[in-house]
């Protein structure tokens, strides 16, 4: 049903859903702090633009009695319950910030007349792609998939002269929310990744993964997994690995690789890490000081959600346009705005674009080094290190299938 919005006469409210089930186990207090910091910045920007308006946030908490798993598995109805609460209280703002679980976002989008924009820090799954009033501020699975297909096909770099068409995907069901949906997208038989690969098998047991590492009859030398180095070590330990195995470790929301004193452990030598380019000033910013690297990105997405709303509000007010219209609801895409840590670009479907960074472990220095970067906005690769000190033979990534002729 239509809910009246607190969104006019110089007073603009943001509804922030504070859900018990969340993509990352972040204390709600930290998210509140991020939102409040964002509000301060927005108020300053609007004031500087000569717009004398009030912007506030209303935090909507779920009671936590029914939906208390803390992760995203029981989140499907929690979002709808919160929306019902908003509806009953007649407290809908101009924009909804909150659902981070793919299940809850998908259900909320499906079951409501969304005449207002929804901004999510998460909602990584393919089922949340191409939603007209949904904006996602953390890299969704589709972006990962496009990078992987692009990289698999590449055969014109001095360190990668083979096109790949095969892969194993390790997915054991204990993944974090982001990893769950990233791997889910790679597993899906109808996905772009599956469509472009000739062979793909999902490994679900630790033993399956461990056996592949030295199996002479393996169908691919490439294994994709998602998580941090510790996750890999728990699985792989110090087991021997065939010399032409390449593990692609997807660990997007983790800045630790770029810290000065970090040394790569020996078990990372056959691994390429895919992560995001770190922010310029995040490491010492006030709101992120007490957050772990992953949670920093999550809280930052909330903060940037507020800044995005401020950006759109400013544009519409300056143009004398109404905020409670479908036009406003559909406007949160195909734009660049000034985020907390520099410009943030959203694609045509409201999904954040970013620079993905592929790292390798230098056998000389035992440090993580940048191999290449990839701009998801233009799907363009930027090679960085043309002579990487790889563990692999001839400093080239091996063929994905053992025994194919030289190239």
């Amino acid at each position: 049903s239509q809910v009246s919005q607190n969104c006019h006469n110089g007073s603009y409210e943001i509804s922030v859903l504070m859900m018990g089930n969340s993509a990352f186990a972040e204390p709600l207090k930290n998210l509140e702090d991020a939102v409040n910091e964002g509000l301060e910045i927005v108020r300053g920007r609007l004031q500087n633009a000569g717009l004398n308006v009030t912007v506030n946030a209303t935090f909507m908490y779920s009671d936590g009695l029914i939906h208390n798993s803390g992760d995203c598995r029981s989140s499907t109805c929690e979002g709808l319950d919160l929306l019902r609460k908003i509806s009953n209280a007649q407290r809908m703002g101009c924009v909804l910030i909150g659902p981070s679980c793919t299940y809850s976002t998908f259900q909320m989008y499906l079951d409501t007349e969304l005449s207002y924009p929804m901004i999510s820090a998460g909602s990584f799954g393919l089922s949340c792609d191409y939603k007209e009033t949904l904006t996602r501020l953390m890299s969704p699975a589709r972006k990962l998939m496009y990078f992987l297909v692009n990289f698999w096909k590449t055969n014109d770099l001095p360190f990668k002269t083979y096109s790949w068409s095969t892969s194993y995907v390790y997915k054991n069901g204990t993944e974090t929310e982001d990893c769950f949906w990233y791997l889910n997208a790679l597993e899906a038989s109808v996905s772009y990744f599956s469509h472009e690969l000739g062979f793909k098998v999902v490994l679900r047991q630790d033993k399956e993964f461990q056996d592949i590492l030295m199996d002479h009859n393996r169908k691919s030398n490439v294994i994709i997994m998602c998580g941090g180095p510790e996750f890999l070590y728990k699985l792989k330990g110090d087991r021997a690995v065939a010399e032409d195995i390449v593990i692609i470790l997807v660990d997007l929301f983790n800045d630790q690789y770029f810290e000065d004193n970090v040394t790569a452990p020996d078990y990372m030598k056959n691994v390429l890490v895919l992560t995001l380019s770190p922010g310029n000033s995040l490491l010492n910013s006030s709101f992120s000081r007490n957050l772990s690297p992953t949670k920093r990105d999550f809280a930052l997405a909330y903060l940037n959600g507020i800044l995005l709303f401020g950006h759109m509000l400013k544009i519409f007010l300056e143009n004398g346009e109404n905020i409670t219209t479908p036009k406003f609801a559909h406007a949160f895409r195909n734009l660049t705005f000034e985020g907390y840590d520099g410009p943030v670009t959203l694609d045509d479907w409201g999904d954040v674009d970013s620079t993905m960074v592929l790292l390798y472990t230098s056998v000389d220095t035992k440090k993580y080094k940048v191999l290449l970067t990839y701009d998801t906005h233009v799907n363009k690769t930027y090679p960085v290190d043309m002579s990487p000190t790889f563990t692999w033979k001839n400093s080239k990534l091996p063929n994905d299938i053992t025994g194919r002729g030289p190239q």
Partner: antibody, heavy 118, light 106 residues
Framework: EFQLQQSGPELVKPGASVKISCKAS????????MNWVKQSNGKSLEWIGL????????NYNQKFKGKATLTVDQSSSTAYMQLNSLTSEDSAVYYC???????????WGQGTLVTVSA | QIVLTQSPAIMSASPGEKVTISCSAS?????MYWYQQKPGSSPKSWIY???NLASGVPARFSGSGSGTSYSLTISSMEAEDAATYYC?????????FGAGTKLELK
């Protein structure tokens, strides 16, 4: 529009060093690898090395290790190549060129003539 | 490192004539790259990834080849095509160039 403007010609004595510059404009300087290429007296082209302005990664042709040192100044979008212990063999035109993958050496500076003579 | 051998070293062609410049590699490559250089000027990227023309290159130019044998072809020679053409590989590090083919107008 990618543009690379190199410093002017240099006449230097044997044993000395020279530092030539390449100022970039019209694109995001830190995104693209900057290469340096040598061309001796109208002859063929020899790749010296590259530097990635964002990460500071350098790759050198083994032949030029110890001869050339590549650096960048991000604030002025300028790349530098220092050549040391110069001999007559180092007399050549030196070009900077950026990769715009999938094309290598996609855009070139106008070249800097270095003449080593007593 | 990979050695590229260009042939011929020098050639001349009349306007309208078809021209083929060859480049042979000392080991197998996936792609070849070509550059054009005119006297007193910098080289220009001309053909990348064997057969893709760089921006502004006339359609009379084409590139082909595989393995160790590659070529640049001009379907109909024009006066402005007189230049030196270099082939280049980046299949293996370091990148290397051929010695060049000087194409003159007859």
């Amino acid at each position: 529009e990618f543009q690379l403007q190199q410093s002017g010609p240099e006449l230097v004595k044997p044993g000395a060093s020279v530092k030539i510059s390449c100022k970039a404009s019209g694109y995001s300087f830190t995104d693209y690898n900057m290469n340096w290429v040598k061309q001796s007296n109208g002859k063929s082209l020899e790749w010296i090395g590259l530097i990635n302005p964002k990460y500071g990664t350098t790759n050198y042709n083994q032949k030029f290790k110890g001869k050339a040192t590549l650096t960048v100044d991000q604030s002025s979008s300028t790349a530098y190549m220092q050549l040391n212990s110069l001999t007559s063999e180092d007399s050549a035109v030196y070009y900077c060129a950026i990769d715009d993958y999938p094309a290598w050496f996609a855009y070139w500076g106008q070249g800097t003539l270095v003449t080593v003579s007593a | 490192q990979i050695v590229l051998t260009q042939s011929p070293a020098i050639m001349s062609a009349s306007p309208g004539e078809k021209v083929t410049i060859s480049c042979s590699a000392s080991s197998s490559l996936n792609y070849m790259y070509w550059y054009q250089q005119k006297p007193g000027s910098s080289p220009k990227s001309w053909i990348y990834r064997t057969s893709n023309l760089a921006s502004g290159v006339p359609a009379r130019f084409s590139g082909s080849g595989s393995g160790t044998s590659y070529s640049l072809t001009i379907s109909s020679m024009e006066a402005e095509d007189a230049a030196t053409y270099y082939c280049q590989q980046y299949h293996s590090y370091p990148p290397t160039f051929g010695a060049g083919t000087k194409l003159e107008l007859k």
